[in-house]
């Protein structure tokens, strides 16, 4: 039960996270005009990864796309790339994890395959989350640098009558959405990796032991132990007897060759 819950929760958390990463990538408010000096502005500027916008106090909003590719700052291109990589990895991870879910049966897919798929999707979610967090953090760092540079310019070179006051930008909503979404995707990925440990049947090293059935004969089903996924160390050897009590995680709905004694 715990493994199924962990896997399911990991999937849901990752799904929310990836949806958030997509939303953040599409949002226009990555940076917003700093209103510290002029809280009642007639023109409010904000910028995203793909276009910059102006909300006029008259109530109209106009956006202009970045139609150039080569003319854009390298950092912005890097952030775009990180976010897109994060989305692609996350989307593939979601696709893989759907088939890996314990509650979904596809033909006679072995638990080992599901465990491997769970691990794969988990790793993808972790990388996806890290990409998003990295992308947002790079953009935030760029904003902080530009903010202090424009602040410095604001208080120098004011000898003439004309003040070319630069518009300063601060963190927009998309940054916070991106950080939270990246974190959720990362947590979801970790949960999937943890679930993978519970899904993988442990490799048992059986010594030559003489079993004596007392009273009545017990049929032993030989072999068929699955190879360990190599994720974590398997110390417990679960011996499950036919007809014995099972935890919900160990119950299988169809007879299987993996009912071990």
């Amino acid at each position: 039960m715990a493994v199924t819950a962990c896997q399911g929760l990991g999937f849901v958390v990752s799904l929310i996270g990836i949806a958030g990463i997509i939303a953040a990538t599409c949002m226009d408010q990555w940076s917003t005009q700093d209103l510290y000096n002029n809280p009642v502005t007639a023109v409010f500027n904000y910028q995203g990864l793909w276009r910059s916008c102006v909300r006029e106090s008259s109530g109209f909003t106009e956006c202009r796309g970045y139609f150039t590719l080569l003319g854009l700052p390298a950092m912005l291109q890097a952030v775009r790339a990180l976010m897109i990589v994060g989305i692609v990895l996350g989307a593939i991870g979601l696709l893989v994890s759907i088939f890996a879910l314990k509650c979904i049966r596809i033909g006679s897919m072995e638990d080992s395959a599901k465990a491997n798929m769970t691990l794969t999707s988990g790793i993808m979610f972790i990388v996806s989350g890290l990409c998003a967090i990295a992308g947002v953090s790079v953009f935030a760092n760029m904003l902080v640098t530009n903010f202090w540079m424009s602040t410095a310019n604001m208080y120098t070179g004011m000898g003439g009558m004309v003040q070319t006051v630069q518009t300063r930008y601060t963190f927009g909503a998309a940054l916070f959405v991106g950080w939270v979404a990246g974190g959720l995707t990362l947590i979801g990925g970790v949960m999937m990796c943890i679930a993978c440990r519970g899904l993988a049947p442990e490799e048992t090293n059986y010594k030559a032991v003489s079993y004596h059935a007392s009273g009545h004969s017990v049929a032993y089903k030989p072999g068929g132990f699955k190879a360990s996924t190599g994720f974590g160390s398997n110390t417990k050897n679960k011996k499950i007897y036919d007809g014995g009590a099972r935890t919900e995680d160990e119950v299988q709905s169809y007879p299987s060759k993996h009912d071990y004694v």
Partner: antibody
Framework: EVQLVQSGAEVKKPGSSVKVSCKAS????????MNWVRQAPGQGLEWMGQ????????KYSGKFQSRVTITADKSTSTAYMELSSLRSEDTAVYYC???????????WGQGTLVTVSS | DIVLTQSPDSLAVSLGERATINCKSS????????????LTWYQQKPGQPPKLLIY???TRESGVPDRFSGSGSGTDFTLTISSLQAEDVAVYYC?????????FGQGTKLEIK
């Protein structure tokens, strides 16, 4: 057709108040800011403030902040500008003007002359 | 507050000649978000309210004759009347819509020489 019709000329005593009205027609009154601008005889244009009738939000020029009150009545599509503690230098033509795309004043009322005289 | 300074205060031009009015802002009026300058030009004839001519520094309002044109960016702007007509005699004002309070230039009186 967009039209802004203002109330008639007023003669006021110093220290009193004046309330000028501006009736809008031909557009969705609640969806556009309404500005008030004044022009003293032979002088330039001076922005006083604005109101968004849909919400009642207002913005005022610092110069008039303490003396001007701008209101709007959505039911009659009318904006009002009240100026208190009148002085002789408040003698001017007061205009209402719709605020539009590009932060411009695209339609103007015909103006209301307010004369402050003892 | 943003200060707009128009020059000259008055201008006399012969009919059919070119008239140029300047407007200088104490601060940039260029918006980074849409790369537009929030400067507007109005024409006011005696006894009438102002009439919108040009917005965003260079966009002509519909119905305005094409002899009127606006140019400039940042802090320096120009209104040009390519061929002055008798009906163009008026006072011309520039106005900024970039920051509150909204401000106007002091006006330029255009007359026929």
């Amino acid at each position: 057709e967009v039209q802004l019709v203002q109330s008639g000329a007023e003669v006021k005593k110093p220290g009193s108040s004046v309330k000028v009205s501006c009736k809008a027609s031909g557009y969705a009154f609640s969806n556009y800011w309404m500005n008030w601008v004044r022009q003293a005889p032979g002088q330039g244009l001076e922005w006083m403030g604005q109101i968004y009738p849909g919400s009642g939000d207002t913005k005022y020029s610092g110069k008039f902040q303490s003396r001007v009150t701008i209101t709007a009545d959505k039911s009659t599509s009318t904006a009002y500008m009240e100026l208190s503690s009148l002085r002789s230098e408040d003698t001017a033509v007061y205009y209402c003007a719709r605020f539009y795309y590009g932060n411009v004043m695209d339609y103007w009322g015909q103006g209301t002359l307010v004369t402050v005289s003892s | 507050d943003i200060v707009l300074t128009q020059s000259p205060d008055s201008l006399a031009v012969s009919l059919g000649e070119r008239a140029t009015i300047n407007c200088k802002s104490s601060q940039t009026l260029l918006s980074g978000g849409n790369q537009k300058n929030y400067l507007t030009w109005y024409q006011q004839k005696p006894g009438q309210p102002p009439k919108l001519l040009i917005y965003w520094a260079s966009t002509r309002e519909s119905g305005v004759p094409d002899r009127f044109s606006g140019s400039g960016s940042g802090t320096d702007f120009t209104l040009t009347i390519s061929s002055l007509q008798a009906e163009d005699v008026a006072v011309y004002y520039c106005q900024q819509g970039y920051s509150y309070p909204l401000t106007f230039g002091q006006g330029t009186k255009l007359e026929i020489k």
